[in-house]
């Protein structure tokens, strides 16, 4: 499955929306920064199978959707930008679902995907626990926004690599 150009553009649009969503200065939140342990190994160029990477992307977008569609998130961000962000994520989920159904078939791959999906879920669990611990403060959301932007930009770069391999 060739990840379509539109998916990469969608990812860029999602990044731009995330960037626009910022409400307070990053710089008042330096002390709140946190290492969430992004599971980079899941996406590593040397060891990932294509199906594994696509499954991990899918899970990452799904979890981002879940994170930003909570009541606490709605209170933190501009509603119009948030709605646009949902649309981009939803479009990307559709793109990736088409890819996942094409790529996944062999049982071993499905098992391997389980590990990568679990790693992504644990990553988002850490993010959720951090937000809870910080009582969903504006700075906590700001830190999380930067983290999601970083993981999105990482996956955008990787998608370019995936497309080149085809």
């Amino acid at each position: 499955c060739d990840l379509p150009q539109t998916h990469s553009l969608g990812n860029r649009r999602a990044l731009i929306l995330l960037a626009q969503m910022g409400r307070i200065s990053h710089f008042s939140c330096l002390k709140d920064r946190y290492d969430f342990g992004f599971p980079q190994e899941v996406f590593d160029g040397n060891q990932f199978q294509k199906a594994q990477a696509i499954s991990a992307f899918h899970e990452m977008i799904q979890q981002t959707f879940n994170l930003f569609s909570t009541k606490d998130s709605s209170a933190a961000w501009d509603e119009t930008l948030l709605d646009k962000f949902y649309i981009e994520l939803f479009q990307q989920l559709n793109d990736l679902e088409a890819c996942v159904t094409q790529e996944v078939g062999v049982e071993e791959i499905a098992l391997m995907n389980e590990d990568s999906i679990l790693a992504v879920r644990k990553y988002f669990q850490r993010i959720t626990l951090y937000l809870m611990g910080k009582k969903y403060s504006p700075c906590a959301w700001e830190v999380v926004r930067a983290e999601i932007m970083r993981s999105f930009s990482f996956s955008t770069n990787l998608q370019k690599g995936l497309r080149r391999k085809d």
């Epitope: 731009i16 910022g22 200065s25 330096l30 920064r33 290492d35």
Partner: antibody, heavy 120, light 111 residues
Framework: QVQLQESGTVLARPGASVKMSCKAS????????MHWVKQRPGQGLEWIGV????????TYNQKFKDKAKLTAVTSANTAYMELSSLTNEDSAVYFC?????????????WGQGTTVTVSS | DIVLTQSPASLAVSLGQRATISCRAS??????????MHWYQQKPGQTPKLLIY???NLESGVPARFSGSGSGTDFTLNIHPVEEEDAATYYC?????????FGSGTKLEIK
């Protein structure tokens, strides 16, 4: 590829003001912070401040708060720094640099630098 | 402001040997798993180049002979084996709090 093109050498009188530019290309200008850094001849680097072109948000090193003013014009993909009330201490090379990895606040791409010479 | 003290101010290392540069912060620049210390290389007449970010992460395209370590207040940049093209001034920079500051630089000469 990412490029930051800075304006040329500036010669100015003490007490005057200068405005230098930094034109960005090869990336989404509005979604990356832009830092400005000072380097005096044969000396180290000093962080002046940073601007977010997307909304014009700025943060300054207190030392440069009354010296430097950062602005950006998104339609031109260009960031600007204006230095006022120039003294000999302001003679230096000034770099614009792109912020890297969001809130890690390090700098991956650098302009070639604008040389400012203050002399009467 | 956090003061970064680099040592030595200059060093000469033979080709193929190890160069070790230290950077000490006047206050911790580490928080919740990350150390906000970064390393740059500046060759004469050129702009600085990012080598290492977050104390130990090698920037893309930077040779593996460069490595960074440390946390809290003490950080080290290692170059091994040193090559001719590594002759430059090396700066550490922190982003632990405002204002961000740089070390005074270490000039590396290749013997």
């Amino acid at each position: 590829q990412v490029q930051l093109q800075e304006s040329g050498t500036v010669l100015a009188r003490p007490g005057a003001s200068v405005k230098m530019s930094c034109k960005a290309s090869g990336y989404s200008f509005t979604t990356y912070w832009m830092h400005w850094v000072k380097q005096r001849p044969g000396q180290g680097l000093e962080w002046i401040g940073v601007i977010y072109p997307g909304n014009g948000d700025t943060t300054y090193n207190q030392k440069f708060k009354d010296k430097a003013k950062l602005t950006a014009v998104t339609s031109a993909n260009t960031a600007y720094m204006e230095l006022s009330s120039l003294t000999n201490e302001d003679s230096a090379v000034y770099f614009c640099t792109r912020n890297y990895k969001y809130d890690y606040y390090t700098m991956d791409y650098w302009g070639q630098g604008t040389t400012v010479t203050v002399s009467s | 402001d956090i003061v970064l003290t680099q040592s030595p101010a200059s060093l000469a290392v033979s080709l193929g040997q190890r160069a070790t540069i230290s950077c000490r912060a006047s206050k911790s620049v580490s928080t919740s798993g990350h150390s906000y210390m970064h390393w740059y290389q500046q060759k004469p007449g050129q702009t600085p180049k990012l080598l290492i970010y977050l104390a130990s992460n090698l920037e893309s395209g930077v040779p593996a002979r460069f490595s960074g370590s440390g946390s809290g207040t003490d950080f080290t940049l290692n170059i091994h084996p040193v090559e001719e093209e590594d002759a430059a001034t090396y700066y550490c920079q922190h982003s632990g709090e405002l204002p961000f500051t740089f070390g005074s630089g270490t000039k590396l000469e290749i013997k």
